[in-house]
Interface confidence: low
């Protein structure tokens, strides 16, 4: 798709000028290259009328000019003395007139209304509200008032007093007579159609001594506003209705082919299946004001976006409407990472968030997608020391490697993980990523016991086995709280038993407590990394009691509780529960999680561009 | 009647610093895009920075970018240009503009002048 882009319909009348501005995306290249106004003919071909070089046709000597706003990637046509010769289908464009950079323009120059003499002129915009007031004489008080419209030489009744209403008005319409003292009747017509434009003629009584008034009515459809956002970010659509709205239900709907536009997200619960899991609508103002969030923006996001309200939840004529054109840039700066994380029950998954590394002092946040109430992103752990209660223990969020990307680390995996989540900070919305986590079959790589239980005064080694793929990378053992995870000394222990075949590259490094206190009991996890990038990570949880027999604990796989697998997670008090509280913090500004905070892209291996961007959470 | 007014010019010292407000009425504010630009002496009125309508976004020109920043308070329908570390060159009128990039309302402009 031309990346150029202006508007679609220019209607004006005879003697009248226009002004059309194209939009293109600024880049240095296309700042300095040829603009263009060009008159499309019957076989095709377009016919320069002017352009930025300096050229123009003597059609158009005297009466037009186009001027470039490099700047801000914009470029201006004025065309006056218009006549209905000038109506036709144009292109604005760059470069070359058949290299195809360019946007189709039809103009439509129609002959003068000829408005009569003392006629209001009504200019609304597109679904709202207008008010006709009709003022009358007191010797037609009592007679019969009426509205018509002037189609082609007849006026067409559309409402009057005695009670009739035209069928294109139904349930739109109506018409108020003030008191007496007033002497003014008025029709108020809602959920103003493209086709309600026109002249009207009201009338009060029916006979040569009747008060007329004329009234021309202009309805205007939303320009849309351009939007221009990197691939793999995030947009922010800011729909303000009005509050005579704001109880009607809310749309965000994407333009297809001719006039249909096919619903993204309403608050009645609809969703496209293509933006599960990086889409919010956030809580409506009172005044009825609403925004939508779409993270995680791909090539085929670009396009024709509507906001509207209405009871059906889409687009139905009438509706009150905001526009915006999506443009998506594919020479992005946020990096490209995966958008599927795999991981095995029992097993773990490290996500690599990328954020805008001028903001490395932001807060980092990680929060779960949830579809219900048009979707939602509880806070699951931030960078400031919180973690959502439920997660305690295997989750964290870890400011390495840093320089643009943050990781969060999530072990103990049961099937209630899988799902879409999102990394955030409270810094550059448009860095908001997303990450689908995958719960696959398999066993995890790392093996630890299952529960541990240390003795007070006594000495605690607590074993860990490490698979020879893992024989490149650093080891480690860290005790887990709400900040991260302190690294502690382990110690290599030799070639593990714990694995057929495989040779004597498989390790177990054993952490070892030394005079237990209270203070060690927690969450243990150990883990692999290379440098500052984290691979899979084991927990393990160690109580602490009272001495009941001399001696130091050697705790083996075998003498403990087996692996973690699903069934030990879902007993017992490592049992997870994923319901996530709503949190206030996510409401903050712009009402939203994603209008504040950035989003996740992914864990931490690299990605074939050819590939479908997934990432396995269990081998690196 | 739609009125568009700027105000906060005046005389500055390089290096200093100003902060312009465009009161706009007569129109619904929060359906434009907003824009300021300036005109210096014997040249052709050029952008300086323009905020969406809801003011989720903002451009700004070459000369201007991390110097000038543009806001607006929609509920107060004002726009504003926060212009600090000024430069000679930076002398112009400045105008505010409502829909700019469409030829919308524009006002009459406030003389910027910064001595050296």
């Known amino acids: 798709k031309s990346p150029i882009f202006g508007p679609e319909e220019v209607n004006s009348v005879e003697g009248n000028s226009v002004s059309i501005t194209c939009y293109y995306p600024p880049t240095s290249v296309n700042r300095h290259t040829r603009k263009y106004w060009c008159r499309q003919g019957a076989r095709g071909g377009c016919i320069t009328l002017i352009s930025s070089e300096g050229y123009v046709s003597s059609k158009y000597a005297g009466r037009a000019n186009l001027t470039n706003f490099p700047e801000n990637g914009t470029f201006v046509v004025n065309i006056a003395q218009l006549s209905q010769d000038d109506s036709g289908r144009y292109k604005c464009g760059l470069g070359i007139n058949s290299r195809g950079l360019s946007f189709d323009v039809s103009l439509e120059v129609s002959q003068g209304p000829g408005l009569l003499n003392d006629t209001k002129v009504y200019t609304v915009d597109l679904g709202r509200t207008v008010t006709i007031n009709c003022p009358f004489k007191t010797e037609n008080a009592q007679k019969r008032k009426s509205l018509y419209k002037q189609i082609g030489l007849y006026p067409v009744l559309v409402i009057d007093s005695s009670g009739y209403v035209n069928p294109n008005y139904t349930g739109r319409i109506r018409l108020d007579i003030q008191g007496t003292g007033q002497l003014l009747f008025s029709v108020v017509i809602n959920q103003l159609r493209l086709s309600d434009a026109g002249q009207y003629l009201c009338q009060a009584g029916d006979d040569s001594n009747s008060n007329k008034k004329n009234a021309d009515l202009q309805v205007l459809k939303p320009e849309p506003e351009l939007v221009y956002e990197d691939l793999r970010g995030s947009v922010t659509f800011h729909c303000a209705l009005g509050p005579e709205v704001a109880n009607v239900a809310k749309f965000l709907c994407r333009q297809s082919s001719g006039e249909n536009c096919d619903v993204v997200v309403n608050t009645l619960g609809k969703r496209a299946p293509a933006f599960e899991g990086r889409i919010l609508l956030n809580p409506q103002d009172k005044d009825g004001s609403f925004s939508v969030v779409i993270t995680g923006l791909r090539k085929e996001d670009a396009g024709r976006y509507l906001c509207g309200a209405h009871s059906d939840g889409q687009l139905q004529e009438g509706s009150p409407i905001q526009a915006w054109q999506l443009f998506v840039n594919e020479e992005s700066t946020i990096p490209r990472s995966p958008t599927v994380v795999k991981g095995v029950a029992g097993g773990s998954v490290a996500v690599l968030c990328p954020y805008n590394r001028k903001e490395s002092k932001s807060i980092k946040y990680w929060c779960l997608w949830e579809g219900a109430q048009n979707g939602r992103c509880p806070l699951l752990v931030d960078s400031e020391g919180w973690v959502k209660a439920q997660y305690e223990g295997r989750l964290s969020l870890l400011e390495e490697p840093g320089n643009g990307t943050f990781t969060v680390i999530l072990n103990q995996l049961t099937s209630r993980d899988a799902g879409f989540y999102w990394c955030l900070t409270n810094g550059d919305t448009l860095w908001r990523t997303t990450v689908e986590i995958k719960i696959i079959e398999g066993e995890p790589n790392l093996k630890v016991p299952g529960n541990v239980t240390a003795v007070l005064g006594e000495t605690l080694k607590v074993p860990c086995h490490f698979p020879c793929k893992f024989s490149s990378y650093e080891k480690y053992w860290c005790k887990w709280n709400n900040t991260g995870c302190q690294a502690l000394p382990s110690q290599d222990e030799g070639p593990s038993k714990a694995f057929v075949n495989c040779d004597e590259n498989s390790r177990l490094v054993s952490l070892t407590l030394n005079l237990v206190t209270r203070a060690d009991e927690g969450w243990y996890w150990c883990g692999v990394k290379q440098g500052h990038f984290y691979g899979e990570t084991a927990a393990v949880y160690v109580a602490v009691e009272e001495r009941k027999a001399a001696g130091s604990r050697d705790v083996s796989l075998a003498k403990a509780d087996a692996a973690p697998d699903e069934k030990v997670l879902d007993s017992g008090f490592r049992e997870i529960e994923n319901k996530a509280i709503q949190d206030p913090r996510l409401f903050a500004e712009e009402k939203a999680v994603a209008d504040t905070r950035d989003q996740a892209d992914g864990s931490r291996a690299s990605v074939d561009s050819g590939s479908s961007e997934e990432q396995g959470g269990s081998s690196r | 009647e739609v009125q568009v007014v700027e105000s906060g010019g005046g005389l500055v010292q390089a290096g200093g610093s100003l902060r312009l407000s465009c009161a706009a009425s007569?129109?619904?504010?929060?359906?434009?895009?907003m824009g300021w630009f300036r005109q210096a002496p014997g040249k052709e009125r050029s952008f300086v920075a323009a905020i969406s309508w809801s003011g989720s976004s903002a451009g700004y020109g070459d000369s201007v970018k991390g110097r000038f920043t543009i806001s607006r308070d929609n509920a107060k329908n004002t726009l504003y240009l926060q212009m600090n570390s000024l430069k000679p060159e930076d002398t112009a009128v400045y105008y505010c503009?409502?829909?700019?990039?469409?030829?919308?309302?524009w006002g009459q402009g406030t003389q910027v002048t910064v001595s050296s």
């Open positions: 007569g129109f619904t504010f929060t359906r434009y895009a």
């Open positions: 503009a409502a829909d700019p990039f469409n030829q919308g309302y």
